[in-house]
């Protein structure tokens, strides 16, 4: 795990985006795969574990001269918490790895509450990159204006 | 240090704007919320909007028609305007800033040191 | 919105004294929740955030617990500067509501 991060607490929530589509968890061929796509109304949410982490963010390292502190988090799926969701920085595609001890920088995301309802995931590792979503699939997204939709999602207590 | 201060006049008649503005230094205002809460006197403390680091707004529903939240990252300004005040709004207001960069779970780590707003003709 | 209940409204307790606030919330905020202490004349202070984390410079006889609907405030010696009044604030939805305060007074 990243150096300095404490983890404050955890707690399941369904995954949807800006225009009501569900993130979900599929098994093919043994993997998991994300899947952003319609649900019906009757049908389950998939759920994801949120960890939340707190990050210090010290003065020399915080724009601004102050000591700082950012809200971290990652994420699994409910159904096997033994796989974060990863920013691949290769491809700027967004997978999920299976982790031996503690996840890698690359399974962190700073959380940015954009409005009442949504939140925007940052990588740790790619500062201006976002979780997003691109033909249907999570994706990393430059984002240069952070109001866009395509990097907002809701988190529900199911 | 981390400073915020809420300036503007301290009595304000029926029916007309109240205006007051938050001055901040010590942290940028595009890495942290700015609140704003107010106290009326001898009662508890109500919460009445945000202006989130990424700009966008959030406003208390059971204000949402009189309250307009502002910011002017120039001047490290955050503004409150409350219209069609009535001696219900007679409060000492303050602002606040977020625990955490970029989202307001951690709750208020800074305050301003508050400013009474009176209402009255 | 999340309503917010604190007990007792007011305490009267001695120096020393092991102090507990309850806060009660109309439904779950994970551990989203902060408590305040605020003085006559004074800004509220940050005591307690997410639930059960001290701010920076506050005494570690403060402390904070529960998860949920279900949180509580604990002064573990009373010392003559901790006669205040305490607000807890849920910070899992906005409107981010607070509770009514409770008055810790000197017996």
């Known amino acids: 795990s990243i150096q300095g991060t404490s983890l404050l607490t955890q707690s399941p929530a369904s995954l949807s985006t800006y225009n009501d589509q569900s993130v979900s968890f599929v098994l093919e061929n043994g993997c998991y795969v994300i899947n952003v796509d319609d649900s019906g109304k009757d049908q389950e949410q998939d759920q994801v574990l949120l960890r939340y982490y707190e990050s210090p963010c010290p003065a020399s390292q915080s724009g601004d001269g102050v000591d700082g502190k950012k809200l971290m988090v990652n994420m699994s799926p409910i159904k096997d918490t033994d796989i974060w969701l990863h920013a691949n920085d290769k491809d700027y595609s967004v997978e999920l790895q299976r982790g031996d001890v503690s996840p890698p920088e690359q399974a962190f995301f700073v959380l940015h509450k954009k409005s009442s309802d949504f939140v925007s995931f940052e990588c740790k590792n790619l500062p201006g990159t976002y979780i997003g979503v691109k033909d249907n699939q999570l994706a990393l997204v430059e984002e240069k204006d952070e109001s866009c939709n395509n990097i907002m999602f809701k988190l529900s207590k199911i | 240090q981390v400073q915020l201060q809420e300036s503007g006049p301290g009595l304000v008649k029926p029916s007309e704007t109240l205006s007051l503005t938050c001055t901040v230094s010590?942290?940028?205002?595009?890495?942290?919320?700015v609140h704003w809460i107010r106290q009326p006197p001898g009662k508890g403390l109500e919460w009445i909007g945000v202006?989130?680091?990424?700009?966008?707004?959030s406003y208390n529903s059971a204000l949402m028609s009189r309250v307009t939240i502002s910011e002017d990252i120039s001047k490290s300004q955050v503004s409150l305007k409350l219209s069609s005040v009535t001696a219900a709004d007679t409060a000492v207001y303050y602002c606040?800033?977020?625990?955490?960069?970029?989202?307001?779970?951690?709750?208020?780590?800074?305050w301003g040191q508050g400013t009474l707003v009176t209402v009255s003709s | 919105d999340i309503q917010m209940t604190q007990s007792p409204s007011s305490l009267s307790a001695s120096v020393g004294d092991r102090v507990t606030i309850t806060c009660l919330a109309s439904?779950?905020?994970?551990?989203?929740l902060a408590w305040y202490q605020q003085k006559p004349g004074k800004s509220p202070k940050l005591l307690i955030y997410?639930?059960?984390r001290l701010a920076d410079g506050v005494p570690s006889r403060f402390s904070g617990s529960g998860s949920g609907t279900d949180f509580t405030l604990t002064i573990s010696s009373l010392q003559p500067e901790d006669f205040a009044t305490y607000y807890c604030?849920?910070?899992?939805?906005?409107?981010?509501?607070f509770g009514q305060g409770t008055k810790v007074e000197i017996k």
């Open positions: 606040a800033r977020d625990h955490y960069y970029y989202s307001s779970f951690g709750g208020f780590a800074s």
């Open positions: 010590g942290f940028s205002l595009s890495k942290y919320g």
């Open positions: 202006l989130r680091a990424g700009g966008t707004i």
């Open positions: 439904q779950t905020i994970a551990t989203w």
């Open positions: 997410a639930a059960t």
């Open positions: 604030q849920q910070l899992y939805n906005t409107p981010y509501t």
